[in-house]
Interface confidence: low
């Protein structure tokens, strides 16, 4: 049986005659053999399989719509041409085979004639008869093969017709699809126009909104500058007021001195000797004792150093002389600061600020200080906690807070955990919690785990100040979820 296969886009037909190595290689591909035996020689036809005779090109790809006919039609034509070639080859090979057999017969006959003895004539005739029979048999078989090839050709022609029909069908489908696509494109362009029109509309709307926004921004910036000017005027007025008060105080002192001088004019004292004024002050108590009894910002000098720091002094509350170390009042300053910032201080002494742990530590280790914490809620109530002994450890000990002797109206129990804890910030976690209290509750504070207070928490405005776990908290006065309106922490020597 003859069989045919396509390798990629061509059909290879192999004829092998008594070449063992060639046959081995073809056997390994697993193709069928057709064998003709002739004496000691055998003739083997190795032909590939008909079932696999398919084009290896990809089936009907997407861009095939652009072609005149589908790919399968081209394949059929190509295959038909190949089959015709094969037919021609087969005919030629059959003729060659006949000639070859006849040649062999002639050679054998000559050999027999040369070598035969008369008594072997009968054997020779028998051999000759056998050869003729075999030739006739092979010719018959070859005729069968030819008939089969013709059958295959007829079958392929039928397939080709079928393919032509399916091609026509496909072409019709493609035409339908093309018209559908055209319809969709029309719809699409209509929608695109609509979208573009809407976009134009939106751009116009956005521009008008932007213009409104710009106008608002101009208004806001104008208001801000007005507010800033007013603030500056207020500051100037406060300073002027402080200056006037100081001048008045100095005048009164001068008048008193003059009166004293007049009353003691007969004494031997030199009237030009005045009390030498202290130039540097360690805290607001010293400022107060030097005669400056007006609230305001004063320059303090660090103990045993020439370094200066500006602090707000409260010269009125509870006898005056208070150094303000913390103030919260309006949320204008961010208290979620680093260890370093809490160490050196930040903010504005006339507003919200933190004086600085290092200064407070050094100061409170020089002598005994009291700490007063003044609190305001959003309902107009005020309270305080007073600790009769307060100091901070050094930075090496994380500015640990030490407190003794609580009195006051902001709770019978200390809202700063006892014994005192180390100071913690967002970048310096020294609390007793697995969590990071400073990051969770915000602000630097002497957190426990995390403890009943945090006066450096988030500032929440009125009506947003309840149920806030990370607000400005003083538990034993207002509970855990209440965020206070204002706080002031102030220190003063115990012997003031």
């Amino acid at each position: 049986m003859w069989q045919i296969v396509f390798f990629t886009l061509s059909c290879d037909l192999v004829l092998a005659a008594a070449y063992n190595n060639f046959r081995k290689s073809m056997d390994s591909i697993g193709k069928k053999q057709y064998q003709v035996q002739h004496g000691s020689c055998s003739y083997t036809f190795l032909l590939p399989e008909m079932d696999n005779c398919r084009s290896s090109s990809s089936p009907y790809v997407s861009n095939a719509v652009q072609r005149d006919a589908p790919l399968e039609y081209d394949d059929s034509v190509q295959r038909l041409q190949v089959l015709e070639n094969i037919m021609e080859n087969n005919t030629q090979w059959l003729m060659k085979l006949e000639n070859y057999i006849q040649d062999n017969m002639k050679k054998e006959m000559v050999e027999i004639q040369q070598n035969a003895v008369q008594n072997q004539t009968a054997v020779m005739i028998e051999i000759g008869t056998n050869l003729l029979n075999q030739t006739a048999e092979q010719t018959r078989k070859l005729t069968d093969v030819e008939a089969q090839v013709l059958n295959q050709t007829t079958r392929l022609e039928l397939q080709l017709l079928e393919h032509s029909l399916s091609t026509n069908k496909l072409e019709k489908q493609i035409l339908d699809q093309t018209s559908e696509i055209n319809k969709l494109q029309d719809k699409n362009s209509f929608l695109e126009k609509k979208v573009l029109a809407m976009e134009d509309k939106h751009i116009i709307q956005l521009q008008s909104i932007k213009e409104e926004k710009d106008q608002l921004q101009v208004l806001v910036s104008k208001q801000n500058s007005i507010i800033e000017e007013l603030e500056k005027k207020i500051v100037t007025a406060t300073v002027n007021n402080s200056v006037l008060q100081k001048q008045q105080h100095d005048l009164m002192e001068t008048v008193n001195n003059l009166l004293t001088m007049m009353s003691t004019s007969n004494s031997a004292k030199d009237p030009t000797v005045a009390k030498e004024e202290q130039i540097s002050f360690r805290d607001c108590a010293e400022v107060f004792k030097s005669g400056h009894t007006t609230n305001g910002i004063y320059t303090l000098t660090f103990p045993n150093s020439t370094e200066e720091i500006k602090a707000y002094c409260d010269m009125e509350a509870g006898g005056g002389g208070w150094t303000i170390i913390q103030r919260r009042e309006d949320g204008s300053v961010d208290f979620q600061r680093t260890w370093k910032e809490y160490k050196v201080g930040f903010g504005n002494p006339s507003g919200e600020y933190w004086l600085g742990n290092e200064f407070v530590s050094q100061l409170t280790n020089q002598q005994r200080y009291v700490l007063k914490i003044h609190l305001k809620d959003w309902e107009g109530n005020e309270a305080y906690s007073l600790y009769e002994h307060f100091y901070l450890s050094s930075e090496e000990l994380n500015y640990r807070i030490h407190l003794k002797g609580l009195t006051g109206t902001a709770g019978k129990i200390s809202s700063i955990s006892q014994p005192g804890n180390d100071f913690s910030t967002k970048d310096g976690d020294n609390d007793k919690c697995i969590c990071k209290c400073s990051q969770m509750l915000t602000g630097g504070w002497w957190f426990d785990a995390c403890g009943p207070s945090n006066l450096n928490g988030m500032y929440y405005p009125q009506r947003q100040n309840t149920n806030k776990f990370n607000g400005i908290k003083w538990y034993y006065w207002k509970g855990s979820g209440y965020s206070l309106k204002a706080t002031t922490m102030m220190i003063r020597p115990a012997d003031f």
């Epitope: 260890w339 370093k340 930075e395």
Partner: antibody
């Protein structure tokens, strides 16, 4: 008097690291924060980060966070700044600067170290 | 991050002239602003801190003013030795330098 003495100029290839030192003298090393500031040719000064005097805490500018490491050796009163994955745009003069005790500005500066990054 | 905008970027004035350099912060820095002078190939030198405080040893012709977001450095009478680039530095929230102002003599 207060002095900050930096290590000499360096030439590095892109992708390499550089480590610049800053030796402090004339003051108590553990009393002041030390900062690193750089200045590329013809550019503004640019703050890179600081190191705490006592516990060695560090903080870096967002821009350099992933590439800079500031360390210190208190016994040698020396701070170090290491910048990794160098690029040509890191070519600059690198300064160490001391922060005031109670003030946040820089009161003393090192003489600067020129780092050139070139292939 | 706070941005610092310095103006002008350069100026040329005669000896004895009054020179003014401004620095604008993108947000309120209260009074935490310093001015530095940097001569070519030299280290920055502190002139003014806390917006208006004159650093010890700095000539009194240098003065600073302003608060919040707008600050000014003034050289009352420009001298040849004042030729340099001047930088502002805000230190209220981290540290940011201005772009610098190059001062030259006409």
């Amino acid at each position: 008097q207060v002095q900050l003495v930096q290590s000499g100029a360096e030439v590095k290839k892109p992708g390499a690291s550089v480590k610049v030192s800053c030796k402090a003298s004339g003051y108590t090393f553990t009393n002041h924060y030390l900062h690193w500031v750089r200045q590329a040719p013809g550019q503004r000064l640019e703050w890179m980060g600081w190191i705490g005097p006592t516990n060695g805490d560090t903080s870096y500018a967002q821009k350099f966070k992933d590439r800079v490491t500031i360390t210190r050796d208190t016994s040698a009163s020396t701070a170090y700044m290491e910048l990794s994955s160098l690029r040509s745009e890191d070519t600059a003069v690198y300064y160490c600067a001391r922060e005031g005790y109670f003030t946040n500005y820089f009161d003393y500066w090192g003489q600067g170290t020129l780092v050139t990054v070139s292939s | 991050d706070i941005q610092m905008t310095q103006s002008p970027s350069s100026l040329s004035a005669s000896v004895g002239d009054r020179v003014t350099i401004t620095c604008k912060a993108s947000q309120n820095v209260i009074k935490y602003l310093a001015w530095y002078q940097q001569k070519p190939g030299k280290v920055p030198k502190l002139l003014i801190y806390n917006a208006s405080s004159l650093q010890t040893g700095v000539p009194s012709r240098f003065s600073g003013s302003g608060s919040g977001t707008d600050f000014t450095l003034t050289i009352s009478s420009l001298q040849p030795e004042d030729v340099a680039t001047y930088y502002c530095l805000q230190y209220n929230s981290w540290w940011t330098f201005g772009g610098g102002t190059k001062v030259e003599i006409k």
